[in-house]
């Protein structure tokens, strides 16, 4: 969490941002809130990106003002116009690109004053893993698959029964480049699994950590998946 304050001229206002991550090819949110104003026409929101020649987005007098928007963001940005009046300056970024990563500044002007706060935005690819029993294998085998990851993650297997066990010798992980030549499909196979046990396939890079669990008993198979972004710090 980053909290910024205005410095000169009028009074300063508090602006708060939250570091976040974007999943390439999908839409992302750059979060920013500020002390609200009673008149929408008095609010100016500027989003800037470090090292970029134009603006990321500008909203003033109740509407977008995009004459100085940088071409790398053309047609890809929007604020939540109906929420600006209550202090929400968050930016929706469409079709997140790898090159959208960097330091952004949310700069606010209201009748009360000015303020800004920076946020770090990471980009990559992350997806939920699915763990299945591989019935084609000669021995009891589990197969963990996740369709889109970038940068290349690490994959670790764990077991509820054999806690602390190292499964690296009885597992095999491969990374297959997807058609867009950036993200990769992750496939990890765990051999010699035992029944009545819960196994976890944990995939992690510097952006996200995802876990796929599978519980195999003689009568049923239960699955559960979980994904957590690693860098959501507020400023």
């Amino acid at each position: 969490l980053i909290i910024g304050f205005g410095i000169s001229g009028r009074h300063s206002i508090t602006v708060t941002t939250v570091a976040s991550a974007g999943n390439i090819g999908e839409d992302g949110i750059l979060s920013c809130t500020f002390e609200p104003d009673i008149k929408l026409s008095d609010i100016v929101i500027q989003w800037l990106k470090e090292g970029v020649l134009g603006l990321v987005h500008e909203f003033k007098e109740g509407k977008d003002e995009l004459s100085e928007q940088d071409e790398m963001f053309r047609g890809r940005t929007a604020v939540f116009a109906d929420q600006v009046i209550v202090g929400n300056a968050s930016l929706r970024l469409k079709n997140v690109q790898l090159t959208d990563a960097g330091t952004y500044k949310c700069y606010i002007i209201t009748s009360k004053g000015k303020g800004n706060a920076n946020l770090e935005y990471k980009t990559g690819a992350f997806s939920m893993p699915e763990v299945n029993v591989d019935y084609n294998a000669s021995s009891e085998t589990l197969r963990c698959e996740a369709p889109r990851w970038f940068p290349q993650p690490t994959v670790v297997w764990a077991s509820q029964v054999d806690q602390g066990a190292n499964f690296s010798e009885v597992s095999n992980t491969s990374f297959e480049l997807n058609s867009e030549n950036v993200t990769m499909k992750v496939v990890s196979v765990l051999y010699n699994v035992t029944i009545n046990n819960t196994y976890s396939c944990m995939i992690e890079n510097d952006i996200a950590k995802a876990t796929g669990d599978i519980k195999v008993t003689e009568s049923e198979i239960k699955r559960r998946s979980h994904l957590q972004l690693l860098n959501s710090k507020a400023s």
Epitope: E50, G51, V52, G54, E68
Partner: antibody, heavy 122, light 107 residues
Framework: EVQLLESGGGLVQPGGSLRLSCAAS????????MSWVRQAPGKGLEWVSA????????YYADSVKGRFTISRDNSKNTLYLQMNSLRAEDTAVYYC???????????????WGQGTLVTVSS | DIQMTQSPSSLSASVGDRVTITCRAS??????LAWHQQKPGKAPKLLIY???SLESGVPSRFSGSGSGTDFTLTISSLQPEDFATYYC?????????FGQGTKVEIK
Amino acid sequence: EVQLLESGGGLVQPGGSLRLSCAASGFTFSSYAMSWVRQAPGKGLEWVSAISGGGGSTYYADSVKGRFTISRDNSKNTLYLQMNSLRAEDTAVYYCARDIQWFGESTLFDYWGQGTLVTVSS
Amino acid sequence: DIQMTQSPSSLSASVGDRVTITCRASQSTRSWLAWHQQKPGKAPKLLIYKASSLESGVPSRFSGSGSGTDFTLTISSLQPEDFATYYCQQYGSYSRTFGQGTKVEIK
């Protein structure tokens, strides 16, 4: 101390290619856009190209569009200008300059290299 | 692209004179204008940015004004080291454009 050091200039025939480099030090290179500016002998300054800090955006003057390519390697703190299909009118001293950090807020072109001479002649 | 036109192209002045150089943009560049000084055989040096902000270390005899399309660089009292060529530069669009330059010579 901020330093920019260009290299790679020289004599090249019309239609030929050349790659200029600019080694940067003394500042956080990836935080700044960078530009190339040229100056023909006895003439004024002409902006050639710029690139955003992360390298995701590139910008060119009409006179070089389609022939020149700007790039950067932030791990090496180095800016490049690949010049293809060179013409006599591309003869100039080429400067690299530190461009903007934050749009509308910061200085730009506050540091320049010493320049490297490119001569296009048969 | 925005075109920048400087006037005059050259001028002769004496030490102590007040010198004014103007720069006109073909379309509004708001306040996104810089002024540079260049001496023969040297790289340019930034004097003014954002139309009127003085770059750190630049003497206060240099000042800039204007917004939109019309801008002015003023040297309040010309010093011997100020004889050089001065360029305006817009940065209000993704391109950056320089004026053709104004050479300040000794009278």
